[in-house]
């Protein structure tokens, strides 16, 4: 065993630029340390088999399978996949250890499968094994956490049913409104299932896997703040638990609290209350209210009452399928160079919705807010006023949602200009649209102030890239003009900008830009 | 460079939970078959496995200890932590983190890397 | 749960000797069984993995051998480095079970 070589099988995993396809050699994408895929004889197999570790690859990820081979002398090397041989360009790192490389760029099905490396060293031959599979994130899911009571014992069981498992924490918060944001430092997280404390004034619990992480937050109604202008509302599917806290504190215990379903009283076994001192010898009750599964019939106004405080209610209703309210109309915006200007979306959603904003095929992330009157508001700032057609896309469990908006950039006309044998063409794209004007530049009119009516074509929007419209303006060829310099000019209520152009033979000969404000 | 490295208090009291933690390098849980064990080994006794857990989220405990572990792994997937609840004196011992690794064709190597360990002592 | 039996528990040899360690299993693992040595104060080394493969950068003075129940570690000729605990382990079904150890010390 000593004579044959040290191996050493490594994964590498790129992080995609959008340039790269096909096989290569050559690195174009950022990539991430090497992971060690624990190459070793492969047991009872004749003749020398390595063998790495099974590699599982998103779809459309990039990799790299290497090994790394200490053996004296040169090296010469095969790679197969599915019975046809690939080169393989050995070269030697600086331990002198010889390298082999596979580049899978966008990993597709047709690409998983046994990839087979035959090395020949001066000392002896063996062939490694790589086993590549696409990972099946199909199966995968992440579902909204949801709560349960913990049997016997005064405290709540958070449990989402996702695969892979999740990581389910608890995040809480003492503080009131803004300071309660994910990373402020009011904010304490806890990575377990069950909560003892329930007392906190924002109760969270979130579950994490690959997919991303989902949060149901405990509803509250504290009976020591002012209520909200519009009632508070809670969604729930039928099936789902419900859970509402009420929370109250006073100067002493005397005091108590119910719950009230449209004026009736909740059955016992719906509900159960927990008190403790706080530390300026005030007491904090809570009495939570509970369905461990909604019917229609559970719709309608819970009230939680207190001997020592305003009543206050939430309407519960209960739907037979997810929704997403909005108006889907699409919005146009015109706004200045430098104008602060953000899209929203106001909406009302259950469950809560997942959303991205699109422009130009690029999706970035999207943050949603709730209000107080029940709607939630999505806002996107980050345009960095481009104009074009910006499509915010929203969807949960059972509906989806899309809104299109188009923003509009007030600014002057910049002009290009390009010829041929027949015709001189400019192009705009300032917004308003431009209006054209060409002029003829000659002994006579040496300022270009001849204007030129005739041969001429303006379209008003010929191109539309990604929303963002291109006016246009065409100058059909005639003796008259021949020879001469021509100049288009772009105007609209901000400028005016013009190119000039020299018609003589073919080909593009823009001569000066004169912009003229 | 493969390496695994534990961590976790050394003195822990009796009832008291001990959390430890497998950090990882060289090689991560992100891939299709890749584990990670703990074992244990108290001073002059043998060793006893204790838990594992895979890439895909599959865990196996001792039979003994089952209702007393519970192992995860970080959503970086680098990370592996054992909890243990309820210790007592007879968990004094230097726990270990390894890693297993499964390969295409269906076999598994088991331990082929461990962490130097951490001498944990229960007592009061 | 299997019961790996290790035997000796403890053996004296000296530099140059053939050393032979059995480990039994309760029941039938097929070849599903790892050799490991540890030094006072480290951490277990594999040297032996599928009953018989020799770990990449092992000295080929080590080799194991059988399937089923018996199982052997053999150390053609004891070299200084090699004072040492041996443990089996078996990983044919769970819950993994390691053997109780065999100490091999200098005569």
């Known amino acids: 065993n000593q004579d044959l070589p040290v191996i050493k099988c490594v994964l590498i995993n790129h992080k995609n630029n959008d340039s790269s396809v096909g096989k290569s050699s050559s690195y174009p994408m950022v990539s991430e340390s090497p992971e060690d895929l624990g190459c070793a004889l492969r047991p009872q197999s004749s003749g020398t088999v390595y063998e790495a570790a099974a590699v599982e690859v998103d779809v459309s990820a990039s990799i790299t399978l290497q090994v790394l081979v200490d053996a004296p002398g040169n090296i010469s090397c095969l790679w197969v996949f599915k019975h046809s041989s690939l080169n393989c360009q050995p070269h030697f790192d600086l331990q002198n250890r010889g390298v082999v490389s596979m580049v899978i760029l966008k990993m597709t099905e047709t690409q998983a499968g046994e990839y087979l490396l035959f090395i020949q060293s001066e000392a002896t031959n063996y062939t490694i094994l790589f086993t590549v599979s696409i990972r099946n994130t199909l199966l995968y899911t992440l579902r909204r956490p949801y709560f349960r009571k913990m049997e016997n014992q005064d405290a709540l069981v958070c449990i989402s049913e996702s695969v892979p498992e999740p990581i389910v924490e608890w995040v809480l918060c003492d503080s009131q409104g803004e300071s309660c944001k994910e990373e402020s430092p009011a904010v304490v997280k806890k990575e377990e299932k069950v909560l003892h404390e329930l007392f906190g004034t924002d109760i969270r619990c979130c579950a994490r896997n690959e997919l991303g992480r989902e949060c149901t937050r405990l509803f509250t109604i504290d009976l020591n703040q002012t209520p909200q202008t519009t009632l508070p509302q809670l969604f729930l599917k039928v099936g789902e638990p419900l859970w509402i806290r009420c929370k109250a504190v006073h100067v002493n215990h005397g005091f108590g609290l119910t719950w009230e379903l449209e004026n009736k009283a909740l059955e016992e076994g719906n509900y159960f209350e927990m008190s403790t001192y706080s530390t300026n010898r005030t007491m904090i009750r809570i009495l939570f209210a509970f369905v461990s599964s909604v019917a229609r019939n559970d719709t309608g106004y819970y009230t939680c009452s207190s001997s020592k405080h305003p009543s206050q209610s939430a309407l519960v209703t209960i739907v037979e399928k997810g929704f997403i309210n909005a108006t889907n109309s699409s919005e146009d915006y015109e706004i200045d160079q430098y104008e602060e200007f953000c899209f929203s979306v106001r909406f009302k959603a259950y469950p809560q919705i997942r959303c991205t904003w699109t422009f130009s095929r690029k999706s970035f992330p999207c943050e949603q807010k709730g209000l107080d009157n029940g709607y939630s508001i999505s806002k996107f700032c980050n345009h960095k006023h481009q104009p074009g057609e910006y499509i915010f896309h929203a969807e949960n469990d059972d509906a989806q949602f899309t809104k299109m908006f188009t923003l509009n950039i007030r600014r002057k006309p910049q002009v290009l200009a390009e010829a041929s044998a027949s015709q001189a063409s400019c192009f705009s794209d300032g917004y308003p649209l431009p209006s054209w004007t060409w002029k003829k530049c000659s002994d006579k009119s040496p300022n270009c102030t001849e204007e030129i009516t005739e041969g001429v074509w303006n379209r008003k929007a010929n191109r539309k890239v990604f929303g963002q419209w291109v006016s246009s303006s065409t100058l059909n060829m005639s003796e008259a003009i021949k020879g001469f310099l021509v100049k288009c000019c772009a105007y609209n209520s901000l400028g005016t900008s013009c190119e000039t152009i020299l018609l003589n033979s073919p080909g593009p000969f823009p001569f000066i830009q004169d912009n003229i404000s | 460079q493969v390496t695994l490295k534990e961590s976790g208090p050394t003195l822990v009291k009796p009832t008291e939970t001990l959390t430890l933690t497998c950090t990882l390098s060289g090689f991560s849980l992100n891939n299709a078959r890749m584990g990670v064990s703990w074992i244990r080994q108290p001073p002059g006794k043998c060793l006893e496995w204790l838990a594992h857990i895979f890439s895909n989220d599959e865990k196996s405990y001792s039979t003994s200890l089952k209702n007393r572990l519970t192992i995860s792994k970080d959503s970086s997937k680098t990370q592996v932590v054992l909890t243990m609840t309820n210790v007592d004196p007879v968990d004094t011992a230097t726990y270990y983190c390894a890693r297993i690794v499964g390969y295409g064709s269906g076999w598994y190597g088991f331990f082929d890397y461990w962490g130097q360990g951490t001498l944990v002592t229960v007592s009061s | 749960d299997i019961q790996m039996t290790q035997s000796p528990s403890s053996l004296s040899a000296s530099v140059g000797d053939r050393v032979t360690i059995t480990c039994r299993a309760s029941q039938g693992i097929r070849n599903d069984l790892g050799w490991y040595q540890q030094k006072p104060g480290k951490a277990p080394k594999r040297l032996i993995y599928a009953a018989s493969t020799l770990q990449s950068g092992v000295p080929s003075r080590f080799s194991g051998s059988g399937s089923g129940t018996e199982f052997t570690l053999t150390i053609s000729s004891l070299q200084p480095e090699d004072f040492a605990t041996y443990y089996c382990?078996?990983?044919?079904?769970?819950?993994?079970?390691f053997g109780c150890g065999t100490k091999v010390e200098i005569k």
């Open positions: 382990l078996q990983h044919n079904s769970y819950p993994l079970t």
